[in-house]
């Protein structure tokens, strides 16, 4: 895969993942009422990071925001923070990566600057994805803990009720937002890794293109060093050549056809 394609694909994958993180953060269905092994109610409860909702069989849906900060569980606050950090990092990552895209020429920005920006955006996407995955996982863990606690309460609490009046405890299970969040976080992470990989190919290496002349024993010997790359540490010449090689098309030729790789 060419550097431009790898970078472009990484950008698109990250962009999709980032959109998913925003969607998951905004979704109301982080936890949904567990319907299995429960009395069948005509009311369906579900909760998000910002509000809780109730949908009646009548079709009427009512959502109430969590208007308090102090009264909310610390874990929920932590999940909110992680998701917001993930979004903020994602926004920065997108802005940086737009300028870093090889298919977009901005002023006299050289490949070295683009490589650094690509690496930066890749790292930002990776952290953004990790934040989302951790946030969703923390919430899922909280749900599992509460689920088993309420299950235990359901079975232990019935004895002391005299057998007549019973209170049904609403148990919550994984909502759609958790799955969206996990997938979105994973995509953002993968996109970030791809950007980092693309960065390697963008790093300029003079020894690839410039022949160096040595004067030895009165002879003019021109050669290209092969496996010697102390300055970059990116392996052998053949590997770098393979990354840069776009068939018959040169790097400049790719630049003259920006629409093919224009993801902005």
């Amino acid at each position: 895969m060419s550097v431009t394609a790898c970078q472009g694909l990484g950008f698109v994958v990250s962009l999709i993942g980032f959109a998913g993180i925003i969607a998951a953060t905004c979704m109301d269905q982080w936890s949904t009422q567990d319907l299995y092994n429960n009395p069948v109610t005509a009311v369906f409860n579900y909760q998000g990071l910002w509000r809780s909702c109730v949908r009646e069989s009548s079709g009427f849906t009512e959502c109430r925001g969590y208007f308090t900060l102090l009264g909310l569980p610390a874990m929920l606050q932590a999940v909110r923070a992680l998701m917001i950090v993930g979004i903020v990092l994602g926004v920065i990552g997108i802005l940086v990566s737009i300028f870093a895209l090889k298919c977009i020429r901005i002023g006299s920005m050289d490949d070295s600057a683009k490589a650094k920006m690509t690496l930066t955006s890749g790292i930002l996407f990776i952290i953004s994805g990790i934040c989302a995955i951790i946030g969703v996982s923390v919430f899922a863990n909280m749900l599992v803990t509460n689920f088993w606690m309420s299950t235990a309460n359901m079975y232990s609490g019935m004895g002391g009720m005299g057998g007549m009046v019973q209170t049904v405890q609403t148990r919550y299970t994984f909502g759609a937002a958790l799955f969206v969040g996990w997938v979105a976080g994973g995509l953002t992470l993968i996109g970030g890794v791809m950007m980092c990989i693309a960065c390697r190919g963008l790093t300029p290496d003079d020894s690839n293109f410039k022949a160096v002349s040595y004067h030895a024993s009165g002879q003019n010997v021109a050669y290209r060093p092969g496996g010697f790359k102390a300055s970059t540490g990116f392996g052998s010449n053949t590997r770098n050549k393979k990354i840069y090689d776009g068939g018959a098309r040169t790097e400049d030729d790719e630049q003259s056809h920006p629409t093919k790789y224009d993801y902005v």
Partner: antibody, heavy 118, light 113 residues
Amino acid sequence: QVQLVQSGAEVKKPGSSVKVSCKASGYAFSNYLIEWVRQAPGQGLEWMGLINPGSGGTNYNEKFKGRVTITADESTSTAYMELSSLRSEDTAVYYCARVYYGNTFAYWGQGTLVTVSS
Amino acid sequence: DIVMTQSPDSLAVSLGERATINCKSSQSLLNTGNNKNYLAWYQQKPGQPPKLLIYWASTRESGVPDRFSGSGSGTDFTLTISSLQAEDVAVYYCQNDYFYPFTFGQGTKLEIK
């Protein structure tokens, strides 16, 4: 305004079936559940089941499962309730009702008297 | 199924007096998701279908006179008619709107003393 108009009274033999219709008007038929409730003479109200006319989804009272079938025809905005294997104790007024806030029944049909007699 | 028990079975109240009907459910009808009680009250006059008076235990249906009020939470509910009028003579039913199958109380017959 919302209106539910039911079919006329029926006299049936034990073991037979009856199909009561409920024509809705004045609202988007497919957007609201239609419920069926019956009332035996001098007795209380008994919920039989419901249908979501938009999706065709139904929910029946276990007491009537296997004997009651609720259907809906969106093209005519009409809901139907069919009760089979009729017994004398099925003699009742059958009402259709449209669901409202709180899963309640704010709009009712005028009722259809079904008499099961040999 | 949820059992709805109304008391009393019949009630005779003088015109202008307060009438109180109680309803008890075998399970809590409180939904913690929105803190609403899924209980309704209906009025039925002879030869007519029931008429919705109260939903969510205490919310009066539009067009219902404000002398009708509902209260209670969880398993115990009350319908109160603050000042009985002649047209209030009817049978009153409470209904569980939370659990399937929806169930009704046996009814309370309200008469004028």
